[in-house]
Interface confidence: medium
């Protein structure tokens, strides 16, 4: 679903390049099946992330945790609407849930998109501060700052998604038996300016919800990679493997984010450019037909987050094991890790060991010169 509305795809009968559009046909139950899979994995995964974050004691949480939790909340609130969209698609675009749920579930898609991207950006910036400027910006990474940043990003996400809540409606567009959930610009735009509204909302959502955050993320990770690469040359061979793994995780996270959202934003942008550049019909048709699948891929991101951003952390895996253990033998969640620490918040900014830069038994750690050595690089 998008914030867009109708596309005047008409080309006159006497125009040699007229496009012969037809009703879009989904590939049967494929998209609804993917939506339901994302729903199941997303509710389980994001629920697990939230459980892991909130079960840890408050003093053990750091600034990154609030972004992780927000991200999981955003994904969770979105994926619970997917059964509605699965039903809508499966019923060949007949919306049986009424106007309120059309508005709400459409709104949650965009709140999720913005909140997720902003959480990712916040998390990336938090990692940047932790790794590149650990001492100078320590105060910036306090829990209070994280809470304020999260509040701001949620308000911003809620406001940016508001046009969808206002303009989405249900209607029997042709007085047939089917009811659609669609964008209706008639309350804010004249016939001639509807396209301008659609393009305006489309460009702004892509800019604010993808281009700007992704640029910030890439910048953060560029400096993170630079810092890590600098230490490749300085450190012992044993430490090299760890650094390389951290860098590869970062690459996986950024690439996954790009792979999930790039097709959606790219196709949407190309479609909007089409009205100016007049693409060949075949390409125009290709964009129209592939867009639902691009949307589907972007939705998949909401269930990948727990796996990509949390499961890479051994402490998260340990927390999951702890939970399974609790379910079976009623242990109180105090299982100890090999380093003697409790199974703490999986994404806390610093190690919860005996002391700063201290290893097991309190001995000075060899990597004390590396500010990020005890950071958990979790990013969504």
């Amino acid at each position: 679903m998008e914030e867009g509305g109708d596309f005047d795809n008409y080309y006159g009968a006497d125009n040699q390049s007229e496009c012969e559009y037809t009703d879009w046909k989904s590939s049967g139950a494929l998209i609804p099946a993917i939506y339901m899979l994302v729903f199941l994995l997303g509710t389980t995964g994001n629920g697990l992330v939230l459980w892991t974050v909130f079960r840890s004691s408050r003093e053990k949480r750091r600034s990154a945790d609030i972004f992780i939790a927000s991200l999981a909340v955003a994904d969770l609130t979105f994926v619970v609407t997917l059964p509605l969209w699965a039903t809508y698609t499966y019923r060949d675009y007949d919306w049986p849930f009424g106007t309120f749920f059309c508005k709400l579930s459409s709104y949650l898609i965009f709140v999720n998109m913005y909140a997720s991207v902003f959480c990712l950006t916040g998390l990336s910036f938090d990692r940047y501060l932790a790794i590149v400027r650990p001492v100078a910006n320590a105060r910036l990474r306090l829990r209070v700052s994280g809470a304020v940043a999260t509040a701001v990003l949620w308000v911003l996400a809620a406001l940016l998604a508001m046009p969808v809540m206002v303009l989405r409606t249900t209607g029997d567009l042709e007085n047939t038996t089917k009811v659609q959930c669609y964008m209706d610009y008639s309350m804010v735009a004249t016939v001639s300016s509807e396209w301008a509204w659609e393009v305006g909302l489309g460009v702004s959502s892509t800019t604010v919800g993808f281009v700007v955050p992704f640029t910030i993320m890439l910048t953060c990770y560029f400096f993170i990679a630079q810092t890590i690469a600098g230490h490749f040359r300085k450190e012992r061979i044993e430490g090299l493997r760890k650094r390389r793994r951290l860098l590869s995780i970062i690459v996986v996270l950024v690439v996954t984010f790009a792979l999930c959202w790039m097709p959606y934003h790219l196709v949407k942008t190309l479609y909007m450019l089409g009205s100016l550049l007049h693409w060949p019909c075949d390409f125009d048709l290709f964009l129209m037909n592939i867009f639902p699948y691009c949307t589907c891929i972007s939705y998949v991101n909401s269930c990948l987050n727990p796996f990509l951003y949390a499961f890479f952390d051994p402490r998260f895996r340990q927390a999951c094991t702890s939970m399974l253990c609790c379910g079976q033998s009623r242990c109180a969640g105090t299982s100890h890790s090999s380093s003697g620490e409790k199974s703490a918040s999986y994404s806390s900014g610093h190690s919860q060991g005996p002391g700063p830069n201290m290893g097991k038994g309190g001995e000075q750690m060899h990597e004390k010169s590396i500010p990020y050595s005890q950071e958990t690089l979790v990013v969504d």
Epitope: N9, Y21, Y93, L173, E174, Y271
Partner: antibody, heavy 129, light 107 residues
Framework: EVQLVESGGGLVQPGGSLRLSCAAS????????MSWVRQVPGKGLEWVAN????????YYVDSVKGRFTISRDNAKNSLYLQMNSLRAEDTAVYYC??????????????????????WGQGTTVTVSS | DIQMTQSPSSLSVSVGDRVTITCRAS??????LGWYQQKPGKAPKRLIY???SLQSGVPSRFSGSGSGTEFTLTISGLQPEDFATYYC?????????FGQGTKVEIK
């Protein structure tokens, strides 16, 4: 050249049947909705029926429901109108026309009807005893 | 069914005149209205769709406007070939309904 040619019109008695055909050429017939529109001589236009590309959706004006059946054969690029239980008021020139829709890029399943952009020259049906 | 009322039913004008034809819908039809031109013995030809979008190949002297229930077709600077009957068509809901037509004659 985009072209629609109607045939099958003629004189028929009240209560009789007639089958109109429309041969399409110059465009991908299977990609378009198609309509039948009629015009009583010296009077205005009246939309009669239309049919989706694959024939899965059909709509009719109330006055012909249960008597007329619209159908198509995409392999033959042909549109048909089977008219049964004909009445004197069905006397008219019958036009075959190509429908145009705008499709929502974002909201799949949403389409906007843009009227009929290509028309045939018409075939005359006279219902008289 | 949505009733479409066209006015005037006929008008006599000179070449070069500005012509305005109005079409009223019995209920709101958003911008789902088209305008057709028909000459005697010929099939109708679409001029405008979706209230104001000009069919390709149609001269720019034809323009459409309106929204909801009131719509207008304007011919700015009537040409000899424009003398014909004009129909509006609502394409908001089934059944599609035409206006009764406006005949534009030479004065």
């Amino acid at each position: 050249e985009v072209q629609l040619v109607e045939s099958g019109g003629g004189l028929v008695q009240p209560g009789g049947s007639l089958r109109l055909s429309c041969a399409a050429s110059g465009f991908t017939f299977s990609s378009f909705w198609m309509s039948w529109v009629r015009q009583v001589p010296g009077k205005g236009l009246e939309w009669v029926a239309n049919i989706k590309q694959d024939g899965s959706e059909k709509y009719y004006v109330d006055s012909v429901k249960g008597r007329f059946t619209i159908s198509r054969d995409n392999a033959k690029n042909s549109l048909y109108l089977q008219m049964n239980s004909l009445r004197a008021e069905d006397t008219a020139v019958y036009y075959c026309a190509r429908d145009r829709f705008g499709y929502s890029f974002y909201d799949k399943g949403v389409r906007y009807y843009y009227g009929m952009d290509v028309w045939g020259q018409g075939t005359t049906v006279t219902v008289s005893s | 069914d949505i009733q479409m009322t066209q006015s005037p039913s006929s008008l006599s004008v000179s070449v070069g005149d500005r012509v305005t034809i109005t079409c009223r819908a019995s209920q709101g039809i958003r911008n789902d209205l088209g305008w057709y031109q028909q000459k005697p013995g010929k099939a109708p030809k679409r001029l405008i769709y979706a209230t104001s979008s000009l069919q390709s190949g149609v001269p720019s002297r034809f323009s459409g406007s309106g929204s909801g229930t009131e719509f207008t077709l304007t011919i700015s600077g009537l040409q000899p070939e424009d003398f014909a009957t004009y129909y509006c068509l609502q394409h908001n809901s089934y059944p599609r309904t035409f206006g009764q037509g406006t005949k534009v004659e030479i004065k």
